[in-house]
């Protein structure tokens, strides 16, 4: 199963467009057990948004969050 042992949630789609950077408060990676690698951005309204870690804007946001 793409959720492997069902011990971790996974992303099955990525957001198509960049979120406004100001809306994001934190991020985390989904488990390596998932079939699709993903970064999950958590917005200030606590929505968990799946993003493609290969996208330039995603990497830039991660760097920005790490520095803040």
């Amino acid at each position: 199963s793409p959720y492997s042992s069902d011990t971790t949630p996974c992303c099955f789609a990525y957001i198509a467009r960049p979120l406004p950077r100001a809306h994001i408060k934190e991020y985390f990676y989904t488990s390596g057990k998932c079939s699709n690698p993903a970064v999950v951005f958590v917005t200030r309204k606590n929505r968990q948004v799946c993003a493609n870690p290969e996208k330039k804007w995603v990497r830039e946001y991660i760097n920005s969050l790490e520095m803040s």
């Epitope: 199963s1 959720y3 949630p9 996974c10 992303c11 789609a13 957001i15 968990q48 948004v49 799946c50």
Partner: nanobody, 124 residues
């Protein structure tokens, strides 16, 4: 926005089974991930299970894992929650909810459309 209508709740004995159904209409159903949540009296709404747009991916709360199964029929615009080996602590109002498929689905904040709920009461 999606319109969601739950059914299938009721009063059962501990150990029994129930199958909840959620009929959907409105926004294109196949664009959405779906989930079930529940709220017991005096408690916060809690995540139960979620399923991806295609139905390939599912994830469950630890408290229901191995007992509950979420599924969907995209041809009928339906989502289901099969609940087996019910316990008194499963007593709650059960809600069906829809989310953009690019959200993770484990938080109520991931969802933007909610049904009115169906009551499940498990007696000991």
């Amino acid at each position: 926005e999606v319109q969601l209508v739950e059914s299938g709740g009721g009063l059962v004995q501990a150990g029994d089974s129930l199958r909840l159904s959620c009929a959907t209409s409105g926004r294109t159903f196949t664009m959405d991930g779906m989930g079930w949540f529940r709220q017991a009296p005096g408690k916060e709404r809690e995540f139960v299970a979620t399923i991806s747009r295609s139905g390939v991916g599912t994830f469950y709360a630890d408290s229901v894992k191995g007992r509950f199964t979420i599924s969907r029929d995209n041809a009928k615009n339906m989502v289901y929650l099969q609940m087996n080996s019910l316990k008194p602590e499963d007593t709650a109002l059960y809600y069906c909810a829809a989310r953009p498929d690019y959200t993770l689905g484990t938080s109520s904040y991931d969802y933007d459309s909610w049904g009115q709920g169906t009551q499940v009461t498990v007696s000991s």
